[in-house]
């Protein structure tokens, strides 16, 4: 899928007030040091690229990711603010059915997650060089 | 002007299904979550499930695992919720209601008029 | 499974006067994720305050609502007689989507 045309604006603000609070939630107890960025995005639709990526495609050792409640927001989001986003997933989701069943949440889970917040940042600040 | 219109009441023995439908219209059906939510006689709200008709993916609560089906019809705009070995204490009042963006915080904004189903032998 | 507790489950208060009904969280959430509604009978429910404090559209000014961590409230400032209805706080942190039991405003 093609983000281009999406309203970040609005996925943004859905960001800041809901989906955010939600990824701190799912990472409380955790150090915000403990994990090291290795995922970068260079605007924001590329930024939405890696974060669709990251939050619904199975990886190993995190198999749960997408029946978390900040993914089903950030689903959300997308499926509002980014024009057919929602005719593009049938076959994706579809044939990760069995192997997503909310579970308890490991380390490499948590790592991911922190590369999603990272991820969300860089998507709000658009304007900055890559590093 | 968004609406979701439900099925019918429908009058069941204990052991068999129903299946209660959500026409949704004024939007596009495919890009937003739908919710089922049951509502007893004088008692309190609770929550089945969602199901997200973009790619079928759902959500139940674990009391309706195993027993509850929600399933989307993109074609004709319309969520089913299907509910299976019946008893008396499914006797209620079953609600679909539209997940979505509110002011930026994500909540149910519209709701269908409910449909009762009574569970007596 | 997060369980929310509404105080008072019933209510029979006068016009104008002031009403609070609070809402107790097991564990506490984000105040984004904490939802009001308001039911009359033979009624859907219909949204009231979400985020914890942002009224929904059509909801008069004489109602708001507060909060953060486990603690809820929603405050009437001067009751009217339409006000009177079933009102029921939700969390939408985790799974399942609980409600509390419900608060039922009578006027007298």
């Known amino acids: 899928y093609d983000f281009t045309n999406c309203d970040f604006e609005k996925i943004k603000a859905a960001y800041l007030s809901t989906i955010s609070k939600d990824l701190i939630t799912y990472m409380s107890g955790t150090k915000s040091t403990e994990f090291n960025n290795t995922v970068s995005c260079s605007n924001r639709p590329h930024c939405l690229t890696e974060i669709q990526s990251l939050t619904f495609n199975p990886t190993a050792g995190c198999a749960s990711l997408a029946k978390e409640m900040f993914a089903m927001k950030t689903k959300a989001a997308l499926a509002i603010w980014c024009p057919g986003y929602s005719e593009t997933q049938i076959n994706a989701t579809q044939a990760m059915k069995k192997r997503r069943k909310r579970k308890v949440t490991t380390n490499k889970c948590l790592e991911q997650v922190s590369q999603l917040q990272g991820l969300w940042r860089r998507f709000n600040r658009p304007l900055l060089k890559q590093q | 002007q968004v609406q979701l219109v439900q099925s019918g009441a429908e009058v069941k023995k204990p052991g068999s299904s129903v299946k209660v439908s959500c026409k949704a219209s004024g939007y596009t059906f495919s890009s937003y979550w739908v919710n089922w939510v049951r509502q007893a006689p004088g008692q309190g709200l609770e929550w089945i499930g969602q199901i997200y008709p973009g790619d079928g993916d759902t959500d139940y609560a674990q009391k309706f695992q195993g027993r509850a089906t929600l399933t989307a019809d993109k074609s004709t705009s319309t969520a089913y919720m299907e509910l299976s070995s019946l008893r008396s204490e499914d006797t209620a009042v079953y609600f679909c209601?539209?997940?979505?963006?509110?002011?930026?915080?994500?909540?149910?904004?519209?709701w269908g008029q409910g449909t009762t189903v009574t569970v007596s032998s | 499974e997060i369980v929310l507790t509404q105080s008072p489950d019933f209510q029979s208060v006068t016009p104008k006067e002031k009403v609070t009904i609070t809402c107790s969280v097991s564990s506490s959430i984000s105040s984004s994720n904490l939802h009001w509604y308001q039911q009359k009978p033979d009624q859907s429910p219909k949204p009231w305050i979400y985020g914890t404090s942002n009224l929904a559209s059509g909801v008069p000014s004489r109602f708001s609502g507060s909060g953060s961590g486990t603690d809820y409230t929603l405050t009437i400032n001067s009751l009217e007689a339409e006000d009177a209805a079933t009102y029921y706080c939700?969390?939408?942190?985790?799974?399942?989507?609980?409600f509390g039991q419900g608060t039922k405003l009578e006027i007298k």
């Open positions: 939700q969390q939408w942190s985790s799974y399942p989507l609980t």
């Open positions: 209601a539209r997940g979505t963006y509110y002011n930026n915080y994500y909540g149910t904004d519209y």
